[in-house]
Interface confidence: low
């Protein structure tokens, strides 16, 4: 997946620091105080659909074939979304105010692609 | 997930028949000749992000919190994409022209959501 470097408007991964204080989650998340969660942005022209490939690979390939022939079904758009996410360790209060340490999945966007 | 019924512009599942002849895949796919693969379309306002929930749930929730506070990181958009796909059985020629019957995953869009 591409890294956003200011030189492309294609689907890419933008580094982004998520500050838990800014969204009021510091009252239950103990650590970390924030982290690079990143996000996906950019355009998805037809030739990029399904690259690097989301979970919906066969379906994406079919819709892509329609697109390439100018046969777009309705207003379906190709979307720049996370295609690879990773886990991060977090220390937080659960509903009963116990301190819990857990590896939380899908916290960090590692790669982006067109779905 | 919502079904597109012409009364909403929110993220929904649009029924769509995929005709393999139309995209030139009838030369290798024996059966079926086509199928309802469907697709996702519609808008994803902030309050819908992560509903019914894509795989990136924690990350989606965080970005949604930013959105709801008017703190959109850059130009990140919420996207109407398949959140549940299903398998379908297909009969086709493989690379060596053997006839193969296989359950192909991710062929049919069952539900859509905002990621």
């Amino acid at each position: 997946g591409l890294e956003c470097d200011g030189r492309t408007n294609l689907c890419c991964r933008q580094q982004f620091f998520i500050d838990f204080r800014l969204i009021g989650w510091n009252d239950w998340i103990i650590a970390p105080t924030g982290y690079y969660g990143n996000y996906c942005e950019g355009s998805c022209p037809a030739y990029l659909a399904g690259v690097p490939g989301s979970a919906s690979s066969f379906h994406t390939a079919v819709v892509n074939q329609y697109r390439m022939r100018g046969l777009n079904p309705g207003t379906v758009n190709s979307c720049c979304i996370p295609t690879k996410l990773s886990t991060m360790s977090m220390l937080y209060f659960d509903d009963e105010y116990n301190i819990v340490k857990r590896d939380v999945p899908n916290m960090i966007v590692e790669e982006c692609g067109c779905a | 997930g919502l079904e597109c019924d012409g009364r909403t512009n929110l993220c929904c599942r649009q029924q769509f028949f995929i005709d393999f002849r139309l995209i030139g895949w009838n030369d290798w796919i024996i059966a079926p000749t086509g199928y309802y693969g469907n697709y996702c379309e519609g808008s994803c306002p902030a309050y819908l992000a992560g509903v019914p929930g894509s795989a990136s749930s924690f990350h989606t929730a965080v970005v949604n919190q930013y959105r709801m506070r008017g703190l959109n990181p850059g130009t990140v958009n919420s996207c109407c994409i398949p959140t549940k796909l299903s398998t379908m059985s297909m009969l086709y020629f493989d690379d060596e022209y053997n006839i193969v019957k296989r359950d192909v995953p991710n062929m049919i869009v069952e539900e859509c959501g905002c990621a």
Partner: antibody, heavy 116, light 107 residues
Amino acid sequence: QVQLQESGPGLVKPSQTLSLTCTVSGFPLSTSRMGVNWIRQPPGKGLEWIGYINPSGATDYNPSLKSRVTMSVDTSKNQFSLKVNSVTAADTAVYYCARAGYPDVWGKGTTVTVSS
Amino acid sequence: EIVMTQSPATLSLSPGERATLSCRASQSVSTHLAWYQQKPGQAPRLLIYDATNRATGIPARFSGSGSGTDFTLTISSLEPEDFAVYYCLQYTNYPWTFGGGTKVEIK
């Protein structure tokens, strides 16, 4: 490309207030949510984290300095400010601002000497 | 506050040798640890973040390992430009704290 630059007077008298500015270029503070850390380094010594501020003005200060430190932000000027009052010779240091998160982008630093 | 202790204070090695620097936290910081290199008159430069990830543009001879309380920065084969002071930083909890530094000098 994100760049940070510290500026301020090089010499401050004891008991006065040290005022520094960190000017950010490469992303607008009004739309980005990237904060900065202030870090200092006394001559010949190690690094000390002073605190953090984000574009909304939320701050976290090092408890050892909290009573004397104030941080602020002016998004229209793309600037963060640091003030340390009642300075002594122990506040003589190179002062850095660095991008939030694990600090990956640093300014070059500005030297502040506290002396009469 | 979390106290970060680096050892040794000074490491005397020759170019081409392997350098192993240690950083210990007074309590667990998970993998929220970074390593910096600093040369005289310059700002620190990020080498490693999240304990093991090399920052952009950092040569492969630099590697980080560890989690919890014990961390290591390894320079597989010292180049002349690697002689500098190295700091670790924990960023799991405020206040963020740096180690006291390890000076890698030419033997």
